[in-house]
């Protein structure tokens, strides 16, 4: 029995990402005796909750518990029963709930209250449900990707354990795109910041990081589209909107009440002489791009440099991981390869958007039409946001890495959130022990 390995003491954690369009549950695991090491936590499961995001359950708030049942039961199956009581569960809600809170704090509180009551009924160690700030969302996304890329590890290696790792300790910036907001987070070259609101200081594994972050509410891909439509319908001469961001031959009737129900379109709201209008796609990338640019106010900047809408943005520095909808959209369009230049991406988008709707439906027969119809706009929006919004150039484009997963774990804010709340990222570098005492007897 001298060399017989003892069963490893494994710990688990659960984070629910309550996004604007849907909720996902992530299960993480790690060896208990290594929980202060970098890179040991990994995702074992993602469960996508069927149905829309929790902010849409306002009229059916008591059913939120039922909505979460399948994924919570899945967690019960995946995590060994003996571990249930010590497994923390966190729910973080993002921009969909931030928008609901802007409309009605009472309704947002009611939704969260029902979520908390529902999640408390499971045998796990429920730690609470809250709306995280945009700054947290950006910061935790940055922590996640750098943790998974091994950037916090002080051990130098002659080999690369993960893609994109250039064996240096320079952190990656994080670009996150959701349905209702988008975040940019990175370590700028200049340590001093002109805008304290956008500055974060971390001490992780014995090293100080001065991080820039900003979350643009209403600039997620879904809310950006609603903004664009609200802007464009202002100048429409009748109830037909010829839209370059949709394929030629595509038609969709939109209710004006749906258009104006989000706080994101308030600035464009006006009394229209019709209750509905019809979008008719004309599929022109260049015109779509121009229309999207009108959402970014670049005429005012009280700092040395801005992104848009008067928000400070320091000069871009280093490599960036672009994840969530940045990845999902670009992956669908087959544009995630490191070898594809920005010029080539633009060219491909022009070609894609100009394809007739009937042709697109035939080519992607397995994809739901509601999603299929969005890719021309979403792809164009991503290019506009990165190039004109964040000032990436044709040259710096090659520093953007579209990332879905790193080492089997999804890129996103949830892992960083859990690492922080479980105190698994120490401020100081842990003393390395040659051999874990619990491994052999």
């Amino acid at each position: 029995t001298q060399n017989k390995a003892l069963p490893e003491n494994i710990k688990y954690g659960i984070v629910l990402d309550a996004g604007s369009s849907h909720t996902s549950l992530y299960i993480y695991k790690w060896p208990a005796e290594k929980e202060n090491d970098t890179g040991v936590v990994h995702q074992v499961e993602e469960c996508r909750v069927k149905g829309p995001g929790i902010s849409k359950y306002v009229q059916k708030v008591n059913e939120i518990g039922i909505y979460l049942t399948d994924c919570m039961e899945r967690a019960r199956e995946v995590i060994p029963r003996s571990q249930h009581q010590e497994t923390p569960v966190y729910l973080g809600a993002t921009a969909g709930m931030r928008l609901l809170r802007m409309e009605s704090e009472e309704l947002a509180d009611r939704v969260l209250d029902v979520v908390e009551r529902s999640l408390s009924n499971y045998p796990f160690d429920f730690q609470g449900a809250r709306i995280i700030t945009g700054q947290e969302e950006g910061a935790y996304g940055w922590i996640t990707i750098n943790y998974l890329l091994g950037k916090f590890s002080q051990k130098t290696r002659w080999f690369s354990i993960v893609p994109y790792e250039t064996n240096n300790q320079e952190t990656f910036g994080a670009l996150d795109l959701g349905g209702a907001s988008t975040q940019i987070t990175f370590v700028p070259q200049n340590q001093t910041t002109e805008s304290p609101d956008n500055a974060l200081q971390f001490r992780l594994y014995g090293k100080d990081y001065n991080v820039y972050t900003h979350s643009f509410l209403c600039y997620g891909k879904d809310q950006a589209l609603w903004q664009k439509l609200a802007k464009d319908i202002q100048v429409a001469s009748n109830e037909i909107l010829r839209d370059p961001c949709f394929h030629p031959g595509y038609k969709k009737v939109v209710n004006v009440s749906d258009l104006y129900k989000t706080p994101c379109t308030k600035r464009f709201e006006m009394t229209l002489p019709f209750q509905q209008f019809e979008i008719q796609g004309i599929g022109n990338y260049q015109q779509c791009h121009q229309s999207v640019l009108e959402l970014f106010n670049t005429s005012y900047c009280p700092y040395s440099q801005c992104a848009f809408n008067g928000i400070f943005l320091p000069p871009l520095q280093g490599d960036f991981g672009a994840f969530s909808a940045f990845y999902f959209v670009m992956n669908f369009l087959n544009l995630t390869s490191e070898k594809v230049s920005q010029e080539k991406v633009t060219e491909m988008m022009k070609k894609f958007c100009s394809q007739p709707w009937e042709e697109i439906k035939t080519s992607y027969a397995g994809v739901k039409e509601k999603y299929l119809s969005e890719y021309c706009f979403s792809g164009t929006y991503i290019l506009s946001l990165l190039l004109q919004g964040y000032h990436f150039t044709a040259d710096s484009w090659e520093h953007i890495h579209f990332i879905g997963k790193i080492q089997g774990s999804d890129a996103g804010w949830t892992l960083g959130y859990m690492l922080n709340l479980t105190n698994m990222i120490p401020a100081e570098q842990p003393l390395s022990t040659p051999l874990s005492h619990s491994t052999y007897v």
């Epitope: 149905g51 359950y57 059913e63 049942t69 899945r74 209702a180 879904d222 939109v254 509601k370 969005e374």
Partner: nanobody
Amino acid sequence: QVQLVESGGGLVQPGGSLRLSCAASGSISSIAAMGWYRQAPGKERELVAAITSGGNTNLADSTKGRFTISRDNTKNTVYLQMNSLKPEDTAVYYCNAWGEDDSSWFGTDLCDYWGQGTQVTVSS
């Protein structure tokens, strides 16, 4: 759109049983859960039982041990088996389905479909 058709209601004596059926048709792939609600005269509509697309069930406290909800995926039908019925179970029973609205666009909305309702009367 999803259409829901209920059947199986009627008059039954206290202690008796009934089985309600709800047949769904249309774009049911987007349905996250189906359930039965009831509304007694002068009272608010209340959830009786629900079953998720994953087959997990939820029952109201007042019906636990007496009612069961099940489904037959091949027939797209959900059943509510009601045993040991009491006079206070008298109500109009409605079938409900909800989930992701396939007609919504750029940010998913909730779809919420209801049947016409079937009367259940428990009386001697």
